[in-house]
């Protein structure tokens, strides 16, 4: 446990609990130690959010949370003299922060972002139903790698949806993807309620399509070799190989978890290259192959976004219909 004796009486409440927002969605609470705390008390602070979530016991007089400010969030803080979780803390003091004002029906909805090939982020949204159709939107974004909040420049419209893309390139820094991108959409005139989103960089990643390098037949198998999209290592990807046979009109899809180029037939030591052997393919017929990839759960939280299909490549001969 913590240092010092643990007096039986409850500690006084913390003082000067205040809340502020940094960046777009980093909410920071700070407080001062209680006045008149027992002199032999080594102060620890117990805090939790309004719904009794995220309980924390720590000696710091500060707590932060990355949270989309679309609804009110409250922190309750109390002090105690030990790290003993069963010790009753002081009276809890609460401080809340509310989202920016505005008609909730005016806020944009369906604010979502996809990180394309770990190189640029594309966000889209639907206007709120109580919004003037000529609303001029602006999207702001922030990531730990940026010194300041940035504004997304090129807003476009596709159907009823609006969108904007901005460069976000994965850097070699190992902690880069442990941080999220904070997003806010509002309008220039300040008439609509701003909308916020936090995009973890380990989710909503859509790789570029792979590039088929080589197709060859060996002992009744079709050997497929392809180059993975830049920025991804092969063990972080899951693959789908589709083979269409023009004669039998069969359409086979193979799910591939590991695609190592171990066979001697494959070109070896080619960086970022993956391979797969499709069994039982007739070499005297035309076979058309295409491949797509998605991130896997080994490296990413999300495994739902497939890349587009690669360009097709064919091998074999189309039989004359006699």
């Amino acid at each position: 446990g913590g240092g010092g004796a643990a007096p039986t009486e409850t500690q006084p409440p913390v003082t000067n609990l205040s809340v502020s927002v940094e960046n777009l969605c980093t909410v920071i609470w700070t407080w001062n130690p209680p006045e008149g705390a027992s002199p032999n008390c080594s102060l620890w602070y117990f805090s939790h959010f309004g719904d009794k979530q995220d309980k924390k016991l720590a000696p710091e007089t500060r707590r932060s949370k990355e949270v989309p400010l679309n609804e009110k969030i409250c922190l309750q803080v109390g002090s105690q003299c030990s790290t003993n979780e069963s010790e009753k803390p002081s009276i809890l003091v609460e401080k809340c922060i509310s989202p920016p004002e505005g008609d909730p029906e005016s806020a944009v909805t369906e604010l979502q972002c996809i990180w394309h090939n770990l190189s640029y982020m594309q966000c889209s949204w639907l206007p709120g139903r109580n919004t003037s159709p000529d609303t001029n939107y602006t999207l702001y974004y922030w990531h730990r790698s940026l010194e300041k909040i940035r504004q997304c420049e090129e807003i476009y419209k596709e159907g009823q949806y609006f969108g904007c893309s901005f460069d976000l390139t994965k850097v070699k820094d190992s902690s880069f993807e442990q941080h999220s991108v904070q997003i806010m959409v509002k309008d220039y005139a300040g008439k609509i309620k701003p909308s916020f989103n936090i995009v973890p960089l380990t989710s909503r990643v859509k790789p570029d399509p792979p590039h088929i390098k080589n197709l060859s037949f060996h002992n009744g198998d079709l050997h497929v070799q392809w180059e993975n999209p830049q920025n991804f290592i092969s063990r972080c990807l899951f693959y789908e190989v589709e083979v269409n046979n023009s004669q039998t009109e069969t359409h086979n899809v193979f799910s591939v978890q590991e695609a190592k180029c171990q066979n001697p037939e494959f070109e070896r030591n080619v960086e970022n290259t993956s391979c797969f052997m499709v069994p039982g393919v007739l070499p005297d017929t035309l076979n058309t192959v295409r491949i797509r990839v998605k991130t896997n759960k080994l490296c990413y939280e999300d495994d739902k976004l497939w890349s587009n299909w690669s360009q097709e490549m064919s091998i074999g001969k189309k039989r004359n219909s006699t």
């Epitope: 596709e158 159907g159 009823q160």
Partner: antibody, heavy 118, light 107 residues
Framework: EVQVLDSGGGLVQPGGSLRLSCTAS????????MSWVRQTPGRGLEWVSG????????YFADSVKGRFTISRDNSKNTVYLQMNSLRAEDTAVYYC???????????WGQGTLVIVSS | DIQMTQSPSSLSASVGDRVTITCRAS??????LAWYQQKPEKAPKSLIY???SLQSGVPSRFSGSGSGTDFTLTISSLQPEDFATYYC?????????FGQGTKLEIK
């Protein structure tokens, strides 16, 4: 050319249920909200419900909230209106309509008649 | 909800006439108004959106004007196929609401 086809109307008893379907073509279906609008001789045209292109957002008139649900299958270019706890006042011709770039209706289905009567 | 009131509720006119139908909103709706034409036993058809923008494929004899609370639909020279019921609809705020209709009949 944009086409909208609605179906599924019929005669149903008060308290009963009915599911209307709407299939559309000729535009990028997933990018547009689809709505249902009904018409009666007494009340004229009345917007009933809508669903955003992704299906993530749904909207309802107060008169049907809690009784009607709307869904869509973008792989089939189809929208569904599930009508439960039907009342006599729900009797109307129901039109499926594609929204334009905002909440006006630039293409309409031919309409399907729903009669709620015992 | 915003109330939309059309006038007149019915109107008799002859082929070649210039006809004006008006629509009033219970509160300002900027220019976010649409007009529809409906023939008996048929679905409504979009004519105009954003108060004055003609839907593609709609003849240029149809025009719309107005902003705020007062709007008009004008048919510059009536054709036989124009005899129908016309509706206005606001989309400035949710839910979208329609006028009660103006029936245009042959004199």
């Amino acid at each position: 050319e944009v086409q909208v086809l609605d179906s599924g109307g019929g005669l149903v008893q008060p308290g009963g249920s009915l599911r209307l379907s709407c299939t559309a073509s000729g535009f990028t279906f997933r990018l547009y909200t689809m709505s249902w609008v009904r018409q009666t001789p007494g009340r004229g045209l009345e917007w009933v419900s809508g669903i955003s292109g992704s299906g993530l957002s749904t909207y309802f008139a107060d008169s049907v909230k809690g009784r009607f649900t709307i869904s869509r299958d973008n792989s089939k270019n189809t929208v569904y209106l599930q009508m439960n706890s039907l009342r006599a006042e729900d009797t109307a011709v129901y039109y499926c309509a594609k929204e334009g770039d905002w909440i006006y209706f630039d293409s309409w289905g031919q309409g399907t008649l729903v009669i709620v009567s015992s | 909800d915003i109330q939309m009131t059309q006038s007149p509720s019915s109107l008799s006119a002859s082929v070649g006439d210039r006809v004006t139908i008006t629509c009033r909103a219970s509160q300002g709706i900027s220019s976010w108004l649409a007009w529809y034409q409906q023939k008996p036993e048929k679905a409504p058809k979009s004519l105009i959106y954003a108060a004055s923008s003609l839907q593609s494929g709609v003849p240029s004899r149809f025009s719309g004007s107005g902003s705020g609370t007062d709007f008009t639909l004008t048919i510059s020279s009536l054709q036989p196929e124009d005899f129908a019921t016309y509706y206005c609809q606001q989309y400035n705020s949710h839910p979208p609401t329609f006028g009660q209709g103006t029936k245009l009949e042959i004199k």
